[in-house]
């Protein structure tokens, strides 16, 4: 019988008392065979973390800094439930650490050396740990003691709680460095006042500070935020211009066997019965015998952290970088103006082989990192384990939602200035066998479908988006009798037609033979009624152009396109018979890597791009025998995006809206995780 007890860790006598009351009150609001509470008392949060890791307790609520400690080996804990603040309609689970400056001051993030700084307090998250952690490698050596390095970096500071005797420069702007509100420049409002009064040039606070201190928009307009990419933005654009996004207060549990479903069931039922304004007898978010016992008194409720989210993703790349810099104190040897090798993310075995060949030929400019699915690759780019990959538009959308940016676009048409002219896109089409003459766009119900993969543009987002508008529900597996849509749930009818063996069946990578454009077309040839692919797929795999046994005798004339008006047309008439225009595949990366990825890829395509005439004896970046490994095989070049440098601008309003509509049908655990961080 699974143990349905959640052992809550308390760190004081008062917390233990509240925990016992929590335990007793939960008994009547949960079924007798449901989760129950037990209380475990420890001396500190770090002891609680160790106890959970050792399976002596199951859950505790932590601030962001401790979530980082809990995640580190050997603890390996993960966030499972987040407290939220504000309203249920607009729940806030994160705050943003920002650098505020006066509008006319004219310097950027990389020009802070020699400026005067205002901090909320020494060792505090938004006011010290995050900004100093991110600036760590710019601090003058020796970087220990840290206070001395910071004092030598800025020309003067107010860092309340610092030792004014040992580090007088840190108290230059607020004599004495008092560690309470008696110091007018202490805390969030104090640090902002330090900037406002003209004592400092920059204040490190949280995003809400400026709104709490300046009710008038005209006053707020006198200030700006410094962004990590060395630009500035208005103060209300903090979601796109911050130093880090920080979770407020989070319940953690073991990564393996952590009872997260049980913890959620318990806390969700608890907030239902004992949350804000629910009950007089016991209140979850109230601490009569102290402050913030078990949970923050200011919390309004709980949200389940998506299961795909580990601590690194939850805390975010910037926060983890800042805290790791402070804790580990290591900085790269290389001068910062030189690009490090780009770590390319390769999907499964076939892509890894090609990537390794690229790496050798690039003489150290490219390194390879492997993952089993596109989403795993995106996650690795997010957390810094990888740097870049080329993605179908559907995944550019997910990557964009996860904070990545497009940097170059694949171009498929030969032109004189290929690299300077990103194309409008390719066509998403529905292909059928000519012999199935009664089949039209209007009678696909009950037919067998072939898709490149779930979440991809031509194979899924466009056709299923159109279908959703028609049927108004997400049960596509009931609409088609069976199909192959790699990435579907294994027991779904949309995995039934797939050909992968064992664990590879229906996997969204090349181990599944019906994956991708060529795979979906092969599925049509061998088993299906309709394939959703790009307009070039049929010509690329017929007339002897694909030498594989299944394709070598195929004839383009044996296939037709389904038009949205219910008619059919020959394959070459795709311009007048398609489902929609699809954005070209694009290379994505993190914002901090954008310039280097751009620079190195442009060098690489000049060496190994379409200008290489003999691919039998030389490495060709855009060739892989119709398998579309790393890049589409019909790529002519990688083109500059000019001003289309965000996922929304790159994909276009229409496509973003179409994918947004399909979101309610999404099975993407990564998209769910990323929209949790940024709804």
């Amino acid at each position: 019988v699974p143990d349905k007890t959640v052992r809550w860790c308390a760190v004081s006598e008062h917390e233990a008392t509240k925990c016992q009351s929590f335990r007793d009150h939960m008994k009547s609001v949960i079924p007798s065979d449901g989760p129950s509470v037990a209380c475990v008392k420890k001396a500190s949060y770090l002891d609680c973390i160790r106890a959970i890791a050792a399976n002596e307790a199951d859950a505790v609520t932590l601030d962001a800094g401790l979530v980082y400690d809990a995640y580190l080996a050997p603890n390996n804990l993960k966030p499972v439930v987040a407290e939220f603040y504000g309203s249920k309609e607009d729940p806030q689970t994160f705050y943003y650490a920002v650098a505020v400056v006066k509008k006319d001051s004219g310097f950027q993030m990389n020009q802070l050396r020699g400026k005067k700084s205002c901090h909320t307090g020494l060792g505090r998250s938004a006011g010290w740990n995050i900004p100093i952690g991110l600036l760590y490698c710019d601090l003058p050596e020796p970087r220990k003691p840290l206070e001395k390095a910071v004092a030598n970096f800025f020309s003067g500071s107010c860092a309340p709680c610092a030792d004014g005797t040992d580090f007088p420069q840190l108290c230059q702007l607020c004599p004495g460095c008092g560690c309470s509100t008696l110091n007018q420049y202490f805390g969030y409002s104090g640090a902002f006042k330090c900037l406002k009064d003209g004592a400092g040039d920059v204040a490190f606070v949280k995003h809400s500070t400026i709104f709490e201190n300046l009710a008038n928009k005209a006053d707020r307009d006198q200030y700006e935020l410094l962004c990590l990419d060395n630009t500035r933005k208005p103060v209300d654009e903090y979601k796109d211009c911050h130093l880090a996004q920080v979770p407020s207060h989070t319940v953690v549990a073991r990564s393996m066997g952590g009872k997260e479903d049980l913890i959620w069931e318990l806390l969700n039922q608890a907030q239902e019965h004992f949350g804000k304004d629910k009950s007089k007898e016991f209140q979850l978010f109230s601490s009569p015998h102290g402050k913030d016992l078990l949970f923050k008194d200011s919390a309004h409720g709980f949200l389940k952290v998506p299961p795909r989210m580990d601590a690194k993703m939850y805390l975010g790349y910037e926060y983890v970088t800042a805290i790791r810099n402070l804790r580990e104190g290591t900085c790269p040897e290389a001068p910062t103006d030189e690009c490090k090798p780009v770590k390319w993310c390769a999907l499964s075995h076939h892509e890894r082989l090609k990537c390794d060949e690229w790496s050798v030929n690039s003489v150290g400019k490219i390194e390879c990192v492997s993952a089993e699915t596109t989403e795993d690759c995106i996650a690795k780019i997010m957390n810094g384990e990888a740097d870049a990959m080329s993605l179908d538009g559907g995944f550019v959308y997910i990557a964009g939602k996860c904070g990545l940016v497009p940097v170059l676009a694949e171009n498929y048409n030969k032109s004189d200035n290929c690299e300077d002219t990103p194309e409008a896109g390719y066509f998403a089409i529905a292909v059928v066998k000519k012999s199935a003459s009664d089949l039209t766009w209007d009678n696909l119900k009950g037919k067998k479908s072939c898709h490149t993969a779930v979440g991809r543009t031509a194979g899924w987002n466009i056709p299923m988006g159109l279908l959703y508008n028609k049927i108004n529900h997400c049960r596509f597996d009931e609409f088609f009798s069976e199909g192959c849509a790699p990435g579907s749930k294994k027991d779904s009818s949309l995995c039934k037609l797939c050909m992968g063996s064992g664990l590879n069946l229906c996997e969204p990578n090349n181990k599944e033979g019906y994956y991708g454009y060529t795979g979906a077309f092969r599925c049509l040839v061998e088993k299906g009624d309709v394939a959703f692919v790009k307009h070039q797929t049929v010509p690329q795999n017929t007339g002897g152009k694909n030498p594989d046994p299944w394709a070598k005798n195929l004839n383009e004339k044996d296939y037709e396109l389904l038009c949205l008006d219910g008619t059919r047309k020959p394959v070459e008439e795709y311009a007048n018979c398609h489902l929609a225009r699809a954005p070209n595949h694009a290379v994505v990366t993190r914002k901090d890597k954008e310039a280097c990825v751009h620079k190195i890829l442009r060098q690489q395509q000049h060496l190994f791009g379409s200008n290489v005439t003999d691919c039998s004896g030389n490495f060709c970046l855009f060739r892989s025998e119709t398998k579309d490994l790393l890049f589409r095989d019909d790529t002519v070049c990688l083109a500059k995006l000019h001003d289309r440098n965000t996922y929304e601008k790159y994909l276009g309003e229409e496509y973003v809206k179409a994918v947004g509509n399909l979101r309610k049908c999404s099975t993407s655990s990564l998209l769910e995780a990323c929209t949790f961080r940024r709804p």
């Epitope: 699974p2 009547s28 079924p31 007798s32 065979d33 449901g34 069931e265 239902e272 019965h273």
Partner: nanobody, 128 residues
Framework: DVQLVESGGGSVQAGGSLRLSCRAS????????MGWFRQAPGKEREGVAV????????YYADSVKGRFTISEDNAKNTVYLQMDSLKLEDTAMYYC?????????????????????WGQGTQVTVSS
């Protein structure tokens, strides 16, 4: 108005399998106890399998443990009951039910009295 729509019932040989579906419409799906109950002719309604929607625990009657699996699809607001190794005694009308609002529990998750929203039912017949 909350509605539960069941489907997937039918006749099957002993040892065979069936998959029942129950779709909830008209309410916030996550964070409720929802599951399957059955009633054979002349017998009381009994709990079969329940889950806490939106990623919570699962609960099974002893008589079906290891043979039946309850699961959910959040995107479709749907709960499934996969019934394998069916026996003659599994023959019954199967009902989907949901706890909406804050119920008070004095007994187990499989106690039908706590559930306030019910579907019309779907017949499952197992023959030898």
């Amino acid at each position: 108005d909350v509605q539960l729509v069941e489907s997937g019932g039918g006749s099957v040989q002993a040892g065979g399998s069936l998959r029942l579906s129950c779709r909830a419409s008209g309410h916030a799906y996550s964070g409720n106890y929802m599951g399957w109950f059955r009633q054979a002719p002349g017998k009381e309604r009994e709990g079969v399998a329940v889950l806490y929607t939106g990623g919570g625990s699962t609960y099974y009657a002893d008589s079906v443990k290891g043979r039946f699996t309850i699961s959910e699809d959040n995107a479709k607001n749907t709960v499934y009951l996969q019934m394998d190794s069916l026996k003659l005694e599994d023959t019954a009308m199967y009902y989907c039910a949901l706890v909406l609002g804050s119920a008070r529990w004095y007994t187990s998750s499989l106690d039908a009295r706590a559930y306030n929203i019910w579907g019309q039912g779907t017949q499952v017949t197992v023959s030898s």
